[in-house]
Amino acid sequence: RKIPKVGHTFFQKPESCPPVPGGSMKLDIGIINENQRVSMSRNIESRSTSPWNYTVTWDPNRYPSEVVQAQCRNLGCINAQGKEDISMNSVPIQQETLVVRRKHQGCSVSFQLEKVLVTVGCTCVTPVIHHVQ
Amino acid sequence: GITIPRNPGCPNSEDKNFPRTVMVNLNIHNRNTNTNPKRSSDYYNRSTSPWNLHRNEDPERYPSVIWEAKCRHLGCINADGNVDYHMNSVPIQQEILVLRREPPHCPNSFRLEKILVSVGCTCVTPIVHHVA
């Protein structure tokens, strides 16, 4: 599960482990569960009291190249009458994911793992009220 | 794989797509150093669709710890602080990529894995099915 830092001695690995040069790791980017589909409730982004839109970010030097980001549509939340209630706040919910970055240095290519913060959707919260003395 | 623009001066033999297996530097770059200041640790309590967080551990996965959300109620919290069952709390789920040790227990050989995590909850209007 855990990745040792560069330049440190590695655990005496089982014979079945592939040989890997120091300071790097072998990564198979054929994704396990590639065809798994999200079974989220239908169009919750539109039915939510804190609705959001999706935009697709594209980066050809990233794997996967497509990352979907959500943006809250409103500052406030949608009330029962379908109107925006600014006494409540729509706020983004975020989650970290890993991507592989491809870097070109001259004609040579290297690969780097990267943590990317993805906005997944929005939720409606009661605001924090700061009382000024 | 995905197509990569390449330096026109480089040999043509270079593959334009991501290869199936790559050697990756062990140091992970963090794109999130300037974390969004709106990212708050108390949304789970202040939301009208509050959730609890559960610590999911998997020794063969990187990251080894992922926090998962579970909605506290079927309904949503109204202005009076009561659960309103005319609305529904639903999980916001996201597919994320993690690393899975492959073969198992190997210290520096991994495969990408797509997993589904519940990140938080949101309050939605229910879908009403009218029976004829």
């Epitope: 655990f11 | 999130n32 150093t33 640790s41 967080l53 063969e60 926090w67």
Partner: antibody, heavy 119, light 107 residues
Framework: EVQLVQSGAEVKKPGASVKVSCKAS????????FHWVRQAPGQGLEWMGV????????AYNQNFRDRVTITADKSTSTAYMELSSLRSEDTAVYYC????????????WGQGTLVTVSS | DIQMTQSPSSLSASVGDRVTITCKAS??????VGWFQQKPGKSPKLLIY???NRYTGVPSRFSGSGSGTDFTFTISSLQPEDFATYFC?????????FGQGTKLEIK
């Protein structure tokens, strides 16, 4: 430089509560978990629980579940551990420790806070 | 809970000696074991993580090995500053548990 600075020693009566703080500096507070571990005099270390300041999630050792509460204040980059219904066997040094959730190990520890429970 | 049984509980040695401490887990913990040094009145200091990886700045005389249930920590040539208590810890699954410690004293 990463630092975890804990609050000072406390003397408490049985049945009382104690709240120990751990102030972090030198890194982004919300990026890593905070764990609390205690060490009774002459004894080994005992894990009490964890908080992730980034999302507010907590998990506790069942042995302490009903008595311990771990919180975090992002505005001051401080984690807290409150232990209630104190008894004499809770006399111990209490440590906070930073845990790297990706890599999966404790790298930095606070200097410890001695809590003495005595009537 | 996973038990970590550490031995010996105390050990007398001289400067220059090679010292070995063992830790046995009650069930497999893969390579998810760390070794810490603690001096009186001080907090634990990480020496080894993931069974065999030296933490940043830790001298090369400290090493660790093992996987599954059996783990070993070695100081190849004791220095005066190494006299302290050492303990192992598993972070394979919570509740995370620790060995009882080995007190290393000057002979």
């Amino acid at each position: 430089e990463v630092q975890l600075v804990q609050s000072g020693a406390e003397v408490k009566k049985p049945g009382a509560s104690v709240k120990v703080s751990c102030k972090a500096s030198g890194y982004t507070f919300t990026d890593y978990e905070f764990h609390w571990v205690r060490q009774a005099p002459g004894q080994g270390l005992e894990w009490m629980g964890v908080i992730h300041p980034g999302n507010g999630g907590t998990a506790y050792n069942q042995n302490f579940r009903d008595r311990v509460t771990i919180t975090a204040d992002k505005s001051t980059s401080t984690a807290y551990m409150e232990l209630s219904s104190l008894r004499s066997e809770d006399t111990a040094v209490y440590y906070c420790a930073r845990f790297l959730t990706y890599e999966g190990y404790f790298d930095y520890w606070g200097q410890g806070t001695l809590v003495t429970v005595s009537s | 809970d996973i038990q970590m049984t550490q031995s010996p509980s105390s050990l007398s040695a001289s400067v220059g000696d090679r010292v070995t401490i063992t830790c046995k887990a009650s069930q497999s913990v893969s390579i998810d074991v760390g070794w810490f040094q603690q001096k009186p009145g001080k907090s634990p200091k990480l020496l080894i993580y993931h069974a065999s990886n030296r933490y940043t700045g830790v001298p090369s005389r400290f090493s660790g090995s093992g996987s599954g249930t059996d783990f070993t920590f070695t100081i190849s040539s004791l220095q005066p500053e190494d006299f302290a208590t050492y303990f192992c810890q598993q972070d394979y699954s919570s509740p995370y548990t620790f060995g009882q410690g080995t007190k290393l004293e000057i002979k």
